[in-house]
Amino acid sequence: EQAPGTAPCSRGSSWSADLDKCADCASCRARPHSDFCLGCAAAPPAPFRL
């Protein structure tokens, strides 16, 4: 986990101000509106699961 302004988050994660930590880009599949998803350089999330 990285503080803002320090080294970037590891591959597959992006900084979340809401969570105050690096968050998994993979979770954008289920929660595409999370604040960190814009920072994820992955393809658009798969269809939302229920």
Epitope: G12, D18, L19, D20, A23, D24, C25, A26, S27, R29, A30, R31, H33, A42, A43, A46, R49, L50
Partner: antibody, heavy 119, light 111 residues
Framework: QVQLQQSGGGLVQPGGSMKLSCIAS????????MSWVRQSPEKGLEWVAE??????????HYAESVKGKFTISRDDSKSRFFLQMNNLRAEDTGIYYC??????????WGQGTDLTVSS | DIVMTQTPASLAVSLGQRATISCRAS??????????MHWYQQKPGQPPKLLIK???SLESGVPARFSGSGSGTDFTLNIHPVEEDDTATYYC?????????FGGGTKLEIK
């Protein structure tokens, strides 16, 4: 540090009710989805119920085996959540864990509480 | 529901050797980018502890002796070299859809 402190559980007669509670600290509770997972020798680890966050309209989901019997709820102002269990049967016996997940994996876990349904 | 089948149910591995645990899902739990498979370790009297998320991503604080691989329906947890402290039961879990389901567990004994 992160803590999930559980209370409730014990012995209940078939057809009876029980309410489990879980108080969270050390993380942004309101942003997380919360679940109950139970464990028994017969069925192993079994996800029971989930309640999502305010941004997901507090949506709830249940395992088919507990639909209509169990109700999950949360109180973000006090960082706690609950499992109300009604019409309990012997097959509901097990260790119940509260757990948090941002979306996919169960990250933080409570210490577990035993529920025994028996006459 | 997606059925998670773990093999073997138990195994004994000599100290310092490799332990390999397999988990097969009854349908694919992967997109082109990520696999929605996770691994946990559970010791007696304790809750499960997250080891690996998204098939291969090591959880913070977990020793690099643990590694995960696989995609689609077939996944593997490797522990190498095994240590005494690794005596536990290991579980896989998918988060592809609701209901989330777990494998039946693999009990690891260190010889």
């Amino acid at each position: 540090q992160v803590q999930l402190q559980q209370s409730g559980g014990g012995l209940v007669q078939p057809g009876g009710s029980m309410k489990l509670s879980c108080i969270a600290s050390g993380f942004t509770f309101s942003s997380y989805w919360m679940s109950w997972v139970r464990q028994s020798p017969e069925k192993g680890l079994e996800w029971v119920a989930e309640i999502r966050s305010k941004s997901d309209n507090y949506a709830t989901h249940y395992a088919e085996s507990v639909k209509g019997k169990f109700t999950i709820s949360r109180d973000d102002s006090k960082s706690r959540f609950f499992l109300q269990m009604n019409n309990l049967r012997a097959e509901d016996t097990g260790i119940y864990y509260c757990s948090s997940t941002y979306a996919d994996y169960f990250h933080y876990w409570g210490q577990g509480t035993d529920l025994t349904v028996s006459s | 529901d997606i059925v998670m089948t773990q093999t073997p149910a138990s195994l004994a591995v000599s100290l310092g050797q490799r332990a390999t645990i397999s988990c097969r899902a009854s349908q694919s739990v992967s997109t082109s980018t990520y696999s929605y498979m996770h691994w946990y370790q559970q010791k007696p009297g304790q809750p499960p502890k997250l080891l690996i998320k998204y098939a291969s991503s090591l959880e913070s604080g977990v020793p690099a002796r643990f590694s995960g691989s696989g995609s689609g329906t077939d996944f593997t947890l490797n522990i190498h070299p095994v240590e005494e402290d690794d005596t536990a039961t290991y579980y896989c879990q998918h988060s592809w859809e609701i209901p989330y389901t777990f494998g039946g567990g693999t009990k690891l004994e260190i010889k």
